[in-house]
Structures are given as C-alpha cells and as structure tokens.
Amino acid sequence: CKAMHVAQPAVVLASSRGIASFVCEYASPGKATEVRVTVLRQADSQVTEVCAATYMMGNELTFLDDSICTGTSSGNQVNLTIQGLRAMDTGLYICKVELMYPPPYYLGIGNGTQIYVIDPEPCPDSDF
C-alpha cells in the first residue's frame, strides 16, 4: 500500500436545501484505470461511511441507488455532491481515494471538509 495526497476544501456551508458539493482532488502517481472514492463522516470522534463508488477513469461515478451522494470525475478530480443534509448532519466529511487497478495499490485520505448545515426556518403559519 502506497500513500497518496488528497486535497479537499476545509469548510463548506450547505445550501438552504441541504445540498453540499465539493471537489476531492488526488495526486495520482500513475495512470490508474479503476478508482474507488469513499466519503467518511467524523463527528464526536465517531467515523461512519456516508457513501462509496468505484469508477473506471473517464466514466461516471456510480453510487448505490439509495445513496445520498452523486458525483462526476474529471482527470484526478472528483466532484462530490451530498444531498438531503440536515443540521444534525454537520460534521467533518473525509474523502478517501483508492487506486485499485493497475497495481500498485495507492491509498489517500484527505484532511476532511467541515460541512455546516442549517435547517431552514419553518414558514410562519398564514391565515387566509
């Protein structure tokens, strides 16, 4: 297993609709054809997997049908979008990139993006 540098923004404020997008960029030492991207969430020292996708270079990322993540790839960059976020989902979202094929296997883990989520203000009741 060889180490690889992964860069991601330090902090992102989610939209009022609970959507956050960020780029995860990896310094590929070779010509990988198969890449796996995993998003981990760290909050209160607990780490959980949010979503993961394996893709062939030049193809779309395919997450599971019920995943809250979508993404696109371009060269050594992965554009990740996480939706359906609520205030309780605020936390550090860490991008993990694995170059699966061809060997050697490379692993890179970013420092994390703090995604801050604000629940929208409830609409005031209106009398007609």
């Epitope: 923004p9 902090v11 939209s15 209160d44 205030a87 604000i118």
Partner: antibody, heavy 118, light 108 residues
Framework: QVQLVQSGAEVKKPGASVKVSCKAS????????ISWVRQAPGQGLEWMGW????????NYAQKLQGRVTMTTDTSTSTAYMELRSLRSDDTAVYFC???????????WGQGTLVTVSS | EIVLTQSPGTLSLSPGERATLSCRAS???????LAWYQQKPGQAPRLLIY???SRATGIPDRFSGSGSGTDFTLTISRLEPEDFAVYYC?????????FGQGTKVEIK
C-alpha cells in the same frame, strides 16, 4: 503566513450604508470561510454571520437579516461585509475572521472602526 | 439560540495563581464546536482552544480546556503577567453561533 487585512475606519450618518473589506493572503482563499464579528465600545463580541468562500453560501445572525450582506471576490481573495440602514448602535469595531476546518476563528483581521453619528 | 453564560464576570488573581473560568450553555453543545478566545484592549481576539480541549497553534500548555454537554471550563494553570485579559467562549453547535459575555481576569 496567513493574514487578514481590513479597510480603514469609517464615519457614517444614520440611515447610510457601510462596506468593509477584508483581504486575505497566505492560504487558499476559497477553501475556507470568512466570518464577521463586531464589538461595540466597552462591550463583548457579537457574531454577525459568515460566508463560505467555496460556494458563496451565507448564514446571517437573525438580528441583522435584511440589513447585512456578505460577499467574496475569489479573484482578489477579498471578503466584504455591507451593513445598511445604519443606526447609532451599529457603532463598533468590525472584525473579519477565517472560518477553518474546526470552525473556530484562528485568524482575525485587525478590526475596522465604524462610527455612526449625525 | 444557545445562550452562553460565563462566570465569574471578573476574576482577581495574582501572577502564579491558577485561574478557572466557566462557560455554561443553555442547551447541550457538541464538544467539537466549543472554542475559547483571549482578548486584550485594542486587539483582535486570539484563539486559545477549539473543540473544547484542543490547544490552538502556538498556545502555551498552561492553557487547557475541558467539559462537555452544557458545562465547559478554561483553566490557566499558572497566570503569567501577559494572561491578564478578557476571555470569551463561543459555540458553533447550532446557528446562530454565539459568544459568552466574557470573563475579565485582572491583577489582584
């Protein structure tokens, strides 16, 4: 090294607007956020809101909603805070601060005194 | 909104003494999202502690933070002359982010 340099002191009349700038250097500007905090003479710190330089999304203190606008210009690594319909109780030192991975404000501007007086 | 209440309002101590500052939140705050700052007259605040207990870069180890839930503490183990200042806690756990009203540490 990380630096935040703010614009100079301003004197404004009640009802006017003020726009304070905060020029960042020494780091990748759009990877972080910028928060604005003010301090009235002899008083404590009041959080005004923040902007994610990455996507331009903003979060304002309810008290200032409708009067404040925070923006960034990533081409010049500068953040701006505009406050409208100024009142005498808006007289304060206005600070910008970098919002980082742990959200806490590790870097601050030197402060800009805004005086509202007729 | 989460209200942070700091106590005492003023702490009168001598250099070399231990200072214990309290910050109480009106609702539970994740310890990941509590910070402490020091401010001297005419200066911008300076980050001391983030994540309730992690020291910021360049902060001497006489400063320590602890606590969870609604009760947080900043401790200065041995006061140095340059430590006499006003100290603020701040929470990021929920919007709006809020500061405590401050504790002034003055020379006795």
């Amino acid at each position: 090294q990380v630096q935040l340099v703010q614009s100079g002191a301003e004197v404004k009349k009640p009802g006017a607007s003020v726009k304070v700038s905060c020029k960042a250097s020494g780091y990748t500007f759009n990877s972080y956020g910028i928060s604005w905090v003010r301090q009235a003479p002899g008083q404590g710190l009041e959080w005004m809101g923040w902007i994610s330089a990455y996507n331009g999304n903003t979060n304002y203190a309810q008290k200032l909603q409708g009067r404040v606008t925070m923006t960034t210009d990533t081409s010049t690594s500068t953040a701006y805070m505009e406050l409208r319909s100024l009142r005498s109780d808006d007289t304060a030192v206005y600070f910008c601060a970098r919002v980082g991975r742990h959200l806490a404000f590790a870097y601050w501007g030197q402060g800009t005194l805004v005086t509202v007086s007729s | 909104e989460i209200v942070l209440t700091q106590s005492p309002g003023t702490l009168s101590l001598s250099p070399g003494e231990r200072a214990t500052l309290s910050c109480r939140a009106s609702q539970s705050v994740s310890s990941s999202y509590l910070a402490w700052y020091q401010q001297k007259p005419g200066q911008a605040p300076r980050l001391l502690i983030y994540g309730a207990s992690s020291r910021a870069t360049g902060i001497p180890d006489r400063f320590s933070g602890s606590g969870s839930g609604t009760d947080f503490t900043l401790t200065i183990s041995r006061l140095e002359p340059e430590d006499f200042a006003v100290y603020y806690c701040q929470q990021f756990g929920s919007s709006p982010w809020t500061f405590g009203q401050g504790t002034k540490v003055e020379i006795k």
